[in-house]
């Protein structure tokens, strides 16, 4: 009598998550009688997946009618596949007994599950940085299988090269995660810039997933300060202007000091945006020259985005302004524009 064979024709089967997997198995004989059981894995720790005779397996259905006369097809269909179903499945013939005795196993079919990566999530630095500094962006995507995946970074459409990417775990797993860090050197023009993390995977049919981050969340553009004096007015008042330009974000407080004493404090709000995304702001201070015997030291003090204040000081020469004079005299600039303070 010819020895019974258990035939699993496919060495491997690949299925998309959510689909059904068909695992084929046929036997060469009805004899000896006894159940066919399906297991995932081999050895003592193997997991019973299906037993035609005993138990209930709601996700598993036989492909052929097992009650059909001379049925030798014990293929099964597993519904709603998830990455957790990946593994090697064995079709095993048992001889009827008390208990049933294992007779022969098929060679096994490896089920791999193609699972889509999750939408990439891009996170930027916790604190803002200024131009010429390097900031790191992180991109994460999870739950994909197989392990092969491509991740690219772009800034304003140009691929970034200072990138470090890891796929975990390194060994075999039901699903994988990717984490990538891109280092970006900021420029003053980056308020409107965007970084894109692009993930390509076999499950995406050539339509990669993208995660984005705006550099506006990561950049601080410190302001330029310029203080100028307008011409003396007929009423002996001098108009002094503090121009704060090219700053981002908008969060800014400006304080005028006269000879070191606070004269006025203003908060920037609802400013029009420049083309490059930065803001400008102009503040005026009227100084009554006739009320001063000596020169007046004016300071425009700007506190931007919680950073240390930047000062621009300026002296109004009282002696240079006879009461009747109305000419436009240039102010002496005694202040310094302290920028890039951390």
């Amino acid at each position: 009598e010819e020895e019974l064979q258990v035939i699993q024709p496919e060495k491997s089967v690949s299925v998309a998550a959510g689909d059904s997997a068909t695992l084929n198995c046929t036997v060469s004989s009805l004899i000896p009688v006894g159940p066919i059981q399906w297991f995932r894995g081999a050895g003592p720790g193997r997991e019973l997946i299906y037993n035609l005779k005993e138990g209930h397996f709601p996700r598993v259905t036989p492909v052929s009618d097992p009650t059909k006369r001379n049925n030798m097809d014990f293929s099964i269909r597993i519904s709603n596949i998830t990455p957790a179903d990946a593994g090697t499945y064995y079709c095993v013939k048992f001889r009827k007994g008390s208990p049933d005795v294992e007779l022969k196993s098929g060679a096994g079919t490896e089920l791999s599950v193609r699972a889509k990566p999750s939408a990439p999530v891009v996170s930027g630095p916790a604190v803002r940085a200024t131009a010429e500094h390097t900031v790191s962006f992180t991109c994460e995507s999870h739950g994909f299988s197989p392990r092969d995946i491509t991740l690219k970074w772009f800034k304003n459409g140009n691929e970034l090269s200072d990138v470090q990417t890891n796929v975990d775990p390194a060994g075999k797993s039901v699903s994988y995660s990717i984490r990538s860090t891109a280092r970006v050197v900021l420029t003053r023009r980056d308020v409107h810039s965007q970084v894109i993390c692009e993930v390509a995977h076999v499950t995406l049919q050539g339509d990669p997933l993208r995660g984005t981050a705006n550099l506006s969340e990561a950049i601080r553009v410190p302001p330029f300060l310029e203080v100028t004096q307008q011409s003396m007015r007929a009423d002996n008042q001098v108009n002094v202007t503090c121009q704060v330009t090219k700053f981002y974000p908008q969060r800014l407080q400006l304080t005028w000091l006269e000879n070191g004493n606070v004269s006025r404090t203003e908060m920037a709000s609802a400013l029009p945006e420049n083309k490059d995304g930065t803001y400008n702001w102009t503040s005026w201070l009227l100084v009554n020259v006739s009320a001063h015997r000596d020169d007046v030291k004016l300071t425009c003090q700007v506190e931007h985005d919680g950073q240390p204040a930047v000062n621009k000081s300026f002296s109004v020469k009282v002696s240079a302004h006879p009461k009747e004079q109305g000419s436009n005299t240039a102010a002496e600039n005694t202040g310094t524009n302290e920028r890039n303070i951390y």
């Epitope: 009805l30 004899i31 009688v33 035609l52 005779k53 138990g55 097992p66 006369r69 009827k96």
Partner: antibody, heavy 121, light 111 residues
Amino acid sequence: EVKLEESGGGLMQPGGSMKLSCVASGFTFSNYWMNWVRQSPEKGLEWVAEIRLKSNNYATHYAESVKGRFTISRDDSKSSVYLQMNNLRAEDTGIYYCIRDYDYDAYFDYWGQGTTLTVSS
Amino acid sequence: DIVLTQSPASLAVSLGQRATISCRASKSVSTSGYNYMYWYQQKPGQPPKLLIYLASNLESGVPARFSGSGSGTDFTLNIHPVEEEDAATYYCQHSGELPYTFGGGTKLEIK
């Protein structure tokens, strides 16, 4: 351990009705075809009826001698199979066995101890 | 219906000898290379017990002194060497087609 336990037998008059029950244990009842076979000194062993699985739409088959009079049914939730017998005749007298079909081929591997039906006036 | 005829109706065999029981079907019970014939043993007050399935295969737990053979319409049950506990009535049964039928039985007596 596989067990099949019949009940419901007794003495009946011709033309009467009776329902036999069989409770199964020790195996996944819903996965097996079930049968009734009867035995009498006159006719020996005689297959009576078979009921298949839910996946077979609970298909039933009967011996010609009982067709139209007997009805086999099952309740998988109770691991039970039944034989409703109407219009009973003297020749229906015998021991009725509840049987598990192991391999969907009248492979009668487990039999109950039987319940006796006597049809007599 | 397929009629199964068993012979002899009864036989007496000495302890340790061979008992041979025949079962003839009125029509072939073989399909696709398989012989749909079964053999049972029944002792008084007990239900039948399956011995042989598909003509020649020993049911689990049945002693190897029981064997079956045959194909098509002619089938044989052999018991060798016969033991005292083998005294019983033996039945053949087919599942070649519906309805399933049984042979009339062979009563084995041990001498």
